[in-house]
């Protein structure tokens, strides 16, 4: 008789999760030779230890500490790109602008990007059927706690001008409940960060509105200003052209507004 298993509202652990994390770690250390000292088996063991045999609604940042101490690396603090609800474009951007970094360009972010995982209390099994949904089940689930922990430290590292890419097609361009709004904004260090520059990405080709005047952007400006960090905002009306101009800045069409 199969043992009763808790049914959660979210999708289960990504298939072949252990193999995927290990393979990504190996690939990352190959792409980044300066990280070749990283022991990927130790990384996986620490990752696994954070959630295996633990109730998936009772995960804490403490659980991830053995993983958090691994993979020390160098990210220029003035080349950090944060993003909210527009991950794909942010990643396309850093793939072209190789000297800028999103969290997913770092080892720990790269390992976990787009993956889901959870275990079960008192068993060493990984739950491939379902995992807790942040809204419907609980916020202290393995995936949410992981991203909260790594995002906080990434934001703490930033200096000078920090950029954030925001999705202008969303009803809340700046969402206080996003990882950016609830974690990263509050962990920028005012003594190191001079300016937060928001890039609001437009969705429609004919959309010529100044989305920097959006009430949620004004809310972001208020939060940032209260933290003694300057705020600036730019509309990116044509994201396709924006990327093209990052690739080919000498192009004559790149002098006009994008």
């Amino acid at each position: 008789v199969p043992r009763w298993r808790q049914q959660w509202s979210g999708p289960g652990t990504t298939k072949r999760f252990p193999e995927t994390v290990l393979a990504r770690c190996v690939k990352y250390t190959e792409i980044h030779p300066e990280m070749r000292h990283v022991d990927c088996q130790s990384v996986w063991d620490a990752f696994k230890g954070a959630f295996i045999s633990k109730h998936p609604c009772n995960i804490t940042e403490e659980d991830y500490q053995p993983l958090m101490k691994l993979g020390t690396q160098t990210v220029p603090c003035n080349k950090i790109l944060l993003w909210s609800r527009i991950k794909d474009l942010a990643h396309q951007f850093t793939q072209v602008q190789r000297d800028m970094f999103t969290l997913e360009d770092t080892l720990l972010g790269y390992l976990a990007d787009d993956l889901t995982w959870c275990g079960e209390f008192n068993t060493s099994k990984i739950n491939y059927q379902s995992c807790p949904d942040w809204r419907k089940d609980c916020s202290n689930n393995p995936v949410s706690v992981f991203w909260k922990t790594v995002s906080r430290r990434f934001a703490e590292a930033a200096c000078d001008v920090v950029h954030v890419m925001l999705n202008g097609s969303r009803s809340k361009i700046f969402d206080k409940n996003s990882t950016f709004g609830s974690v990263e904004v509050h962990n920028l260090q005012p003594e190191k960060v001079q300016t937060l520059e928001a890039w609001v990405i437009h969705g429609g080709r004919e959309d010529s509105r100044d989305l920097c005047q959006d009430p949620t952007i004004k809310e972001l400006e208020s939060i940032i200003s209260k933290r003694n960090i300057q705020f600036s905002c730019k509309n990116i009306y044509r994201p396709d052209k924006f990327l093209q101009c990052v690739k080919n800045p000498e192009d004559s069409s790149c002098t006009s507004e994008i």
């Epitope: 101490k69 160098t74 906080r152």
Partner: antibody, heavy 120, light 108 residues
């Protein structure tokens, strides 16, 4: 604002022990290694050891052969460095310093230093 | 253990001079993990440059760093009065950590 505040100067006799504290604030205490570095008068920097408050992991400079003990109190965000069997050559300024995870392990914040004088 | 040797141990220079400090490792070091600190008398060291060439927050752009393998340099393009200090190179490794012996930059 990140701050590391160390305890005050100490004068000790040879053979005694000293315990120096370093209280951290303004960042997530658990997720950064804390290093201890000392500097004898007119000399360079010498690494003593490191502690990771998140899980209590510790690494020591073998030179100190069990004389140094590092501990962390997560409830007060404080790390401690105890050095035993003091000798005159342990007279130095002792620094705690945070290891920057995204700074390639560089020490991005330092305490103000604690002068320990060993004299009979 | 990898040793870090700085040269010169001290140097005298005038305001406006270009100054170069060298740090040589006894075996190869990843450029991502080679750092520099500035220390003034009676003060704690300050992170000055990390990952060979990245300036720490607030460090003036007249400072630059370069190098790979075993040889690294810190350069001040035009020495200013506030730059007179001792500079230490440092190689990150879990254990043991090693610092250079320091280079004292003095006023000529």
């Amino acid at each position: 604002q990140v701050q590391l505040v160390q305890s005050g100067a100490e004068v000790k006799k040879p053979g005694a022990s000293v315990k120096v504290s370093c209280k951290a604030s303004g960042y997530t205490f658990n997720t950064y290694w804390m290093q201890w570095v000392r500097q004898a008068p007119g000399q360079g920097l010498e690494w003593m050891g490191a502690i990771y408050p998140g899980d209590g992991d510790i690494t020591y400079n073998q030179k100190f052969k069990g004389r140094v003990t590092l501990t962390a109190d997560k409830s007060t965000s404080t790390v401690y460095m105890e050095l035993s069997s003091l000798r005159s050559e342990d007279t130095a300024v002792y620094y705690c310093a945070r290891e920057g995870y995204y700074y390639g392990g560089a020490l991005d914040y330092w305490g103000q230093g604690t002068l320990v004088t060993v004299s009979s | 253990d990898i040793q870090m040797t700085q040269s010169p141990s001290s140097l005298s220079a005038s305001v406006g001079d270009r100054v170069t400090i060298t740090c040589t490792a006894s075996s190869s070091v990843s450029s991502s993990y080679l750092h520099w600190y500035q220390q003034k008398p009676g003060k704690a060291p300050k992170l000055w440059m990390y990952g060979t060439s990245n300036l720490a927050s607030g460090v003036p752009s007249r400072f630059s760093g370069s190098g790979s393998g075993t040889d690294y340099t810190l350069t001040i393009s035009s020495l200013q009065p506030e730059d007179f200090a001792t500079y230490y190179c440092h190689r990150y490794h879990r254990s043991p950590w090693t610092f250079g012996q320091g280079t004292k930059v003095e006023i000529k």
